[in-house]
């Protein structure tokens, strides 16, 4: 970067090289060039010469003042106009950064995706800081009181093999950057309560000709968890509102769910599951599209039909087997 150049003087920033976005800052340039009493000192930001708010302080030093500096990063350098020199002489350069101190991390969540061998912890980091911000995830056993710390820039995957202190833990997150430090509330977890079953996948759909045509959705999961609760949501692709159906599921065989749908309409289906009575759901599966026939013939849709979709985490509270609309949308 600009900081690696050979300097014939000194450049510095007040209040600091990393500062809060929106602050007024001063950049100082001091020349120390042999046989040169600088006639002028020039400042450049990202290669563009600065024209305004430059004040000469003394024979060798000038100041560039910025009001309400809002750029996350800038490369600054300064030059001198020396008498009898045709070109400007480089003095020095510096990379400067502006941003925000971290917000208090909240919504700390730790889950174990079945078969992953990891506990995945995530959190809401709050507003963008624009500057390098590190997170330390603290995991403390409530049984042994032993604490482990994990440094990361975003989320963290912790091998379940490293969680040797029993089943109960406290987890909290510390956020820190050059402008400040914040710490989340502590989350208490039990390893058995945070397992999310292996992903449920819709494999195919068929509409069967009957007095009232019905559509059967085939879906499955590789989970070994015995008690699993699932939700399937579906809607016509032209609709905003989802219908949600709830199931208590045993994945020893492929699931078949029946729906009575309008003819000649394209529907989208998604499924998600959780261990019964536990806190965390899977994300909704990839969208599965199925168009119902106009009238009689049998139509089958296969899983390769998936389109890209915004897979949200909408929750529906309904009783088993009943069709309900989830008006919260995505």
């Amino acid at each position: 970067g600009i900081t690696n150049i050979n300097c014939s003087g000194h450049i510095w920033v007040e209040p600091a090289t990393i500062f809060k976005m929106g602050m007024n800052i001063s950049i100082y340039c001091q020349a120390a060039i042999k046989n040169c009493q600088p006639r002028k000192l020039h400042f450049y930001k990202n290669g563009i010469k600065e024209r305004f708010q430059i004040t000469r302080i003394n024979k060798t030093t000038a100041r560039l003042w910025y009001k309400n500096f809002l750029e996350p990063h800038a490369s600054m350098y300064c030059t001198a106009e020396c008498p009898k020199h045709f070109q400007e002489t480089l003095i020095c350069g510096k990379d400067i950064s502006s941003g925000y101190p971290p917000d208090i991390p909240d919504e700390v969540t730790c889950v174990i995706y079945e078969y992953s061998g990891n506990m995945t912890c995530t959190w809401n980091a709050g507003k963008l800081t624009y500057i390098d911000t590190k997170y330390v995830v603290h995991v403390k056993s409530l049984e042994t009181e032993e604490e482990q710390q994990y440094l990361t820039s975003s989320y963290i995957n912790i091998s379940t093999d490293s969680l040797q202190g029993g089943k109960k833990y406290l987890v909290w997150v510390q956020a820190a950057n050059a402008l400040g430090m914040e710490e989340s509330k502590q989350l208490q977890i039990h390893l058995d309560d945070i397992v999310i079953p292996s992903a449920a996948v819709i494999s195919r759909a068929e509409t069967i000709n009957a007095t009232v045509p019905k559509t059967i959705i085939y879906w499955d999961s590789q989970t070994t968890i015995e008690k699993v609760s699932c939700e399937m949501r579906y809607k016509a692709t032209t609709n905003q509102t989802w219908n949600v159906k709830e199931f208590d599921t045993n994945f020893t065989y492929v699931q078949q769910s029946e729906f009575y749908l309008e003819p000649n309409i394209k529907y989208v289906f998604q499924v998600r599951c959780q261990e019964t009575g536990k806190r965390y759901w899977q994300p909704w599966s990839s969208p599965f599209f199925h168009k119902t026939p106009e009238t009689v013939p049998q139509v089958t849709s296969k899983a390769f039909q998936h389109d890209t979709w915004n897979s949200g985490l909408t929750v529906a509270s309904i009783s088993t087997g009943h069709l309900t609309s989830d008006n919260r949308g995505d």
């Epitope: 006639r39 002028k40 008498p83």
Partner: antibody, heavy 119, light 107 residues
């Protein structure tokens, strides 16, 4: 050799507008700052507006007395400098010179164009 | 902005005289000073830049000196074509600012 030719001056009523032009030749127009300097009758020289060179990203400057009324611009493809003067006042009456600066002093000047604001 | 004060505002002199015009800046301008000559109905003409550098084509009877806040334009032997108004300009800090002018008249 360097040549600067101003045009667009004339007599105008207060509150009206006028656009001055300055056709430049004989130098690399892009690499130089361009200014409008005015001289009221019997008075000294005053920098009115300035548009800097490419190295300054064409930053503009206006004297407080013309801010929000005058606009300086340049067309590098035509080697021409402009001054759009709106809401003209009697005190804007002056000879307007187009000038070139490489450092910050004015190296070359046009012959000037007279603007008279009078009812 | 930096203020420039020229003195005298006018002077009368004869051909062959040595004439000195001074310009004082409100702060140190580190030799970033230019001198201009303007004749009636004409555009200003650059004589001297960087306080003491003579612009190409300008007669050597014109010279400039000074440092810090005080600067001088000297015409060593006044010629008939030198009767004009002279302006100083600081270009140390933006925006550049002119002195109010010195009118050199025939005595």
């Amino acid at each position: 050799q360097v040549q600067l030719v101003e045009s667009g001056g004339g007599v105008v009523q207060p509150g009206r507008s006028l656009r001055l032009s300055c056709a430049a030749s004989g130098f690399d127009f892009n690499s130089y700052g361009m200014s409008w300097v005015r001289q009221a009758p019997g008075k000294g020289l005053d920098l009115v507006a300035d548009i800097n060179s490419k190295s300054y990203d064409y930053a503009t400057y206006y004297a407080d007395s013309v801010k929000d009324r005058f606009t300086i611009s340049r067309d590098n493809s035509k080697n021409t400098l402009y001054l759009q003067m709106n809401s003209l006042r009697a005190e804007d009456t002056a000879v307007y010179y187009c000038a070139v600066h490489h450092s910050d002093y004015f190296e070359y000047w046009g012959q000037g164009t007279l603007v008279t604001v009078s009812s | 902005d930096i203020q420039m004060t020229q003195s005298p505002s006018s002077l009368s002199a004869s051909v062959g005289d040595r004439v000195t015009i001074t310009c004082r800046a409100s702060q140190d301008i580190y030799t970033n000073l230019a001198w201009y000559q303007q004749k009636p109905g004409k555009a200003p003409k650059l004589l001297i830049y960087h306080a003491s550098s003579l612009q190409d084509g300008v007669p050597s009877r014109f010279s400039g000196s000074g440092s810090g806040t005080d600067y001088t334009l000297t015409i060593s032997s006044l010629q008939p074509e030198d009767f004009a108004t002279y302006y100083c300009l600081q270009d140390s800090e933006y925006p550049p600012t002119f002195g109010q002018g010195t009118k050199v008249e025939i005595k």
